[in-house]
Interface confidence: medium
Amino acid sequence: AGLKLMGAPVKLTVSQGQPVKLNCSVEGMEEPDIQWVKDGAVVQNLDQLYIPVSEQHWIGFLSLKSVERSDAGRYWCQVEDGGETEISQPVWLTVEGVPFFTVEPKDLAVPPNAPFQLSCEAVGPPEPVTIVWWRGTTKIGGPAPSPSVLNVTGVTQSTMFSCEAHNLKGLASSRTATVHLQALPAAPFNITVTKLSSSNASVAWMPGADGRALLQSCTVQVTQAPGGWEVLAVVVPVPPFTCLLRDLVPATNYSLRVRCANALGPSPYADWVPFQTKGLAPASAPQNLHAIRTDSGLILEWEEVIPEAPLEGPLGPYKLSWVQDNGTQDELTVEGTRANLTGWDPQKDLIVRVCVSNAVGCGPWSQPLVVSSHDRAGQQGPPHSRTS
């Protein structure tokens, strides 16, 4: 079989948007199955026709309604003949059009009067492509070959830049890049103090507008009264916009404020935010926990816990915890130093512990008291164990 591409030179140049019909002539075969191939891949679309000129002569058409750059490439046709694939001479399809931008000027944010660069690149075909720069509605500088870099010594206000690419087919305009002026950031807001303990506090905040320059760090300033002596100043890299304050004094009133900085400098401080650290949990366990059996149940007694440090604050109530080996367990809160225990099984051993609480939490547990199921009613059961 003889194959040839008809009606086209080895190189075919077409303007973008124009139609193209590639013709492939096959002679010496009665029913050729003509396939079109572009850059090594079979063209699987339906834009193909086959015309029988005679029994042994066929013409295949590949019809493209409106060529675009992606249609450019190397085309050939092929047929199977006796198990072998015959291929035609290729045709190189070049699609010409107005320049196509591969690099366009990007939006920038720069400090006032700081130098910066903008880039623009466009390609054909046809080549050459020249670039003209625009600042707003003013043309700046003569045509330069593509690619082009525009060096700007600085701006004092937000300014628009664009480039224009020219070739023999016409011109194309790039996107408009806005060069913004950088500024100091705005003050942070929504400052919240969370996870308060007696010596630590977590702070979180929302950053204000960054002034079009990346926020680099934030400073958390802590005082014991608004405007008082600085107790602590922590500089944290951001993001995240959080900070853990350590080594604070328990049960103490503090105030904090936050500011953030970019490359140009710091924002104003946000308003003071007051917070108070928690006091200390009780340090002592109730002593001399003992039990008295009565006809109505079991009475538990212990000695009152006296605060060791003013930071513990007022103590009370007491928390009583009991468990039996049948899995029954319970906790009850008691205001005084005496509790009447009900709902337990006298046939099973009982283990009881007690602790004193304050606003922060419960102190250490007392040593456990084991009330044995063998104890006779009315007898006080001393603890079997002294482990805490």
Epitope: N45, L49, Y50, P52, V53, S63, K65, S66, E68
Partner: antibody, heavy 125, light 108 residues
Framework: EVQLVQSGADVKKPGASLTISCQAS????????ISWVRQKPGKGLEWMGQ????????MYGPSFQGHVTISADRSTATAYLQWRSLEASDTAMYYC??????????????????WGPGTLVTVSS | SYELTQPPSVSVSPGQTARITCSGD??????AYWYQQKSGQAPVLVIY???KRASGIPERFSGSSSGTMATLTISGAQVEDEADYYC???????????FGGGTKLTVL
Amino acid sequence: EVQLVQSGADVKKPGASLTISCQASGYTFTDYWISWVRQKPGKGLEWMGQINRHASNTMYGPSFQGHVTISADRSTATAYLQWRSLEASDTAMYYCVRSGGATSGGTIPEYYQHWGPGTLVTVSS
Amino acid sequence: SYELTQPPSVSVSPGQTARITCSGDALPKKYAYWYQQKSGQAPVLVIYEDWKRASGIPERFSGSSSGTMATLTISGAQVEDEADYYCYSQERKGNYFVFGGGTKLTVL
């Protein structure tokens, strides 16, 4: 004269299989593609798919891929449309159409100029 | 999947110009074809490759395409032109064909 003769109307129950046919005459079967077009009662035309002139390559519309099979027998110049399991929504008129190719003069392409009379398929329980 | 959009109906008086549009994202790259289907009959090709008139079609039928819109124009519509008209084209990659939803032309 180009003629496309389609098999007669058919009534089937849901889940049944069915093959309808389209026999071509008046031209060389292997010079052209055959397409199938569906038209539901009172509705528009839907392109289902086509088989190339060598009966070696099929293309389907997205809605029909996997639901129907298009085939052809070159020796009898007949194209087929086949269902393995019919559904009530398959009730429609089915046209076979000669597509692609060209007139003997090789100038005016005959795009879908020759249509069969249609086969009415009714799927009802 | 790809769609071609047509108006459901167009009405004109006899002798007036009827325009039926068809829009689809691939129409800048793919040719449009137009079919006429009269009640109870198989469709008939009217226009192929955007603007070319099929054999036996009166000169009052013409086609055009611009951007994503193809248009079938009937200059001086006749009562016998009353029918359903379908546009027809390919999706962008050329892997399958699609018919538009159809436009009912009424010549009052």
